[in-house]
Structure formats: structure tokens, C-alpha cells
Amino acid sequence: EPPTACREKQYLINSQCCSLCQPGQKLVSDCTEFTETECLPCGESEFLDTWNRETHCHQHKYCDPNLGLRVQQKGTSETDTICTCEEGWHCTSEACESCVLHRSCSPGFGVKQIATGVSDTICEPCPVGFFSNVSSAFEKCHPWTSCETKDLVVQQAGTNKTDVVCGPQDRLR
């Protein structure tokens, strides 16, 4: 009675169950009555990451420096190459096929989360009591200067883009 289903790591062909090829190897011949499934290792710069019956291995991803990419992890016969972006850039997608420059946070906004190779800068508006007067991919919102602790008084109120201006207290005549 020919099988209708096969065990894990097997596949059904010509009414018989054949072994799948292990990761890192491709199929060159299905099993027969007299021979086992024949597999060959993937070549240099190729991979297969699952038990499979593929007749061709996949090419490793190319991290194109012209697109701002570099190798984060070199591929093996069982894994694809992982790309990331050069310093100051981040991936445009999860697949990391190209990079864009990290965004800067405008004056009035500070960096909530610094960018990584895979995520952009996250900015947040400076709340009352804080300011940012630069466009930066690193600077957080800074607290206004506390004039009181310096025995000074506020001469000019701060905004989300400017610090307060402190001055001496008026002397009583």
C-alpha cells in the first residue's frame, strides 16, 4: 500500500516517501527503490535554511555599499547574510535593502530614542520647562536653567527652543 502521507523531514514522490535534504544542502536526486535521496552542499555564497527539496540554493544577500549597506553577519550554507547600515544611516525596511540618513530633531524637539541600524531617530516635542535650540540626531530636550539656584531671577522666559535668560535680582534702595 503506497503511503499518502510521510513522516517529518520526508516528502512524497512517485508513491514513496523520500528524505528531505538538510539545511545547507540541495536536492540532486529523489530517492528511488534502490537509492536514498541524494543531496549536495550549497556552493560558496549560497544557502538553504530549512529541510528542503530545492534543486537550487539561494544566493546570499549582497550588502551594497552604494546603498549605505554593510555586512552585519556573514551568511553560511544554512543562513542568509544579514545587512545593516553604515553609521548615521538606518534601514528603510525590515529586509534592510537600502538605507536612509537618520533624521535630526528640529529645534523645539529632542531625541526620545537614538536611531539604530534598523530604526530611525524618534523625536518628541520639548515639554514646558525644557528646550532644544539645535537640529540634532542625538540631543535630548534640556531643562531650562534654574535661575533660583544661582540666586538669579528670570529676565526672559524660556520657550521650547530657547533657554530662560537669568539676571541679577533688583536691589532694594
Epitope: 534502490f34 536514498e36 549536495l40
Partner: antibody, heavy 114, light 112 residues
């Protein structure tokens, strides 16, 4: 039905190269591999190599440096080439289809002699 | 490579006798699938090898039931229960579990 027929030069001078053709019928070279096996006179069988359906090859490591197997799918022909022949390469050379262990060619005799 | 060792080299028998040929492999011929690809061939004088037994114990079509194969792992046996004149020739064991395929050195079955 499956058939294989080897044809070769018969006599080869030492240090020269050998070319043998295996013509198959009853199956397609795009779906099955072909193996080469040889047998020196009065001795045992030695596996030489295989060309798989997709064109990949596997060779006997002891002979790899002077052996090459290729094929022409459209003509149903497989070719064995061996370089730098010596007298101990004198043998009957057989081809057989992968998965068709029951069907061997009649073989072609190769004698290496000056 | 897997080395296949066949014994005896020569086996003189009388017609009607039982004959037994041993084949040992240098490593297990059991594939991870559980199958064992050990085969037996008979090569009659002036002919190509002909398949007798495949996967240890399966008789190939048309092979008489006086031929039987047994064994497992690295140790295999071919038995001929009652030798007939047409059985004379050289018997080879062969493994196709591992590439490169390898063959035993052969056992010549001859009349005593």
C-alpha cells in the same frame, strides 16, 4: 525500456586522454543521473562518478583530478573524460542510470597500451 | 569512503549445495531514513553485473527464491539454498547509502 550503451576508442596510449560516450534511452537525462563504474580485467568494480539530472557532478576523490563528466540532454548522451591514462586504467567501463541499478550498459573495453 | 569486505574470495560448491557469502562494511549502511542500501549482484562470465537482491533482502523481479539476503548495520549475508549451474559466476555486494558508491571485491562461485 531503460537501455544504456557505452562507446569508446578501445585502445589508448599511456599519458593520453580517454573519451567515452554513454547513450541512454527509456529515460530522460533531465530527470535522472548517470553513474560511471569500471572493472579492471579479473578484478572488482570501482565507482568513478555521477552526473546528476541538474548537471551537478560527484567524483571518486582518488580520480577527481583527472576525471570529468558532462552531458548533452538533447542527445541523451553522457560523456566521461579521463586524462593521463596509465596501464592500470585498463578496464571495462560501464554506465548506469541512477535508480536503475538493474540496468547496466554492456560496457566498453579500454586498453591502455603503447 | 565505505570499504566493503567480501568473504570468501572463492567458493567451490557442489550443485545442489547451499552457499553463503559474507559482506562487511567499514561503517553502518543504515541511512537516517532507516533504509539500508546494500545490494547483491551476480556477474556471469562475459556479462555486465545483474541485480539479484536490493536493500538487504528484497529479491529483484525474476530472481529465483533460492536466493536470499539478510543482515543489518555492517554485516550482511547472501545465501543460495540449492546451487544450480546457472548460478556460477562472481557475486558482488554494493552499497549506495553513501556517495561514493562502493563494491565488495567479489566472490567467485565455482564447481567443486
Amino acid at each position: 525500456q531503460v537501455q544504456l550503451k557505452e562507446s569508446g576508442p578501445g585502445l589508448v596510449a599511456p599519458s593520453q586522454s580517454l573519451s567515452i560516450t554513454c547513450t541512454v534511452s527509456g529515460f530522460s537525462l533531465t530527470s535522472s543521473g548517470v553513474h560511471w563504474v569500471r572493472q579492471p580485467p579479473g578484478k572488482g568494480l570501482e565507482w568513478l562518478g555521477v552526473i546528476w539530472a541538474g548537471g551537478d557532478t560527484s567524483y571518486n576523490s582518488a580520480l577527481m583530478s583527472r576525471l570529468s563528466i558532462s552531458k548533452d540532454n538533447s542527445k541523451s548522451q553522457v560523456f566521461l573524460k579521463m586524462n593521463s591514462l596509465q596501464t592500470d586504467d585498463t578496464a571495462m567501463y560501464y554506465c548506469l542510470g541512477h535508480g536503475h541499478l538493474d540496468v547496466w550498459g554492456a560496457g566498453t573495453t579500454v586498453t591502455v597500451s603503447s | 569512503d565505505v570499504v566493503m569486505t567480501q568473504t570468501p574470495l572463492s567458493l567451490p560448491v557442489s550443485l545442489g549445495d547451499q552457499a553463503s557469502i559474507s559482506c562487511r562494511s567499514s561503517q553502518s549502511l543504515v541511512h537516517s531514513s532507516g533504509n539500508t542500501y546494500l545490494h547483491w549482484y551476480l556477474q556471469k562470465p562475459g556479462q555486465s553485473p545483474g541485480l539479484l537482491i536490493y536493500k538487504v533482502s528484497n529479491r529483484f523481479s525474476g530472481v529465483p527464491d533460492r536466493f536470499s539476503g539478510s543482515g543489518s548495520g555492517t554485516d550482511f549475508t547472501l545465501k543460495i539454498s540449492r546451487v544450480e549451474a546457472e548460478d556460477l559466476g562472481v557475486y558482488f555486494c554494493s552499497q549506495t547509502t553513501h556517495v561514493p558508491w562502493t563494491f565488495g571485491g567479489g566472490t567467485k562461485l565455482e564447481i567443486k
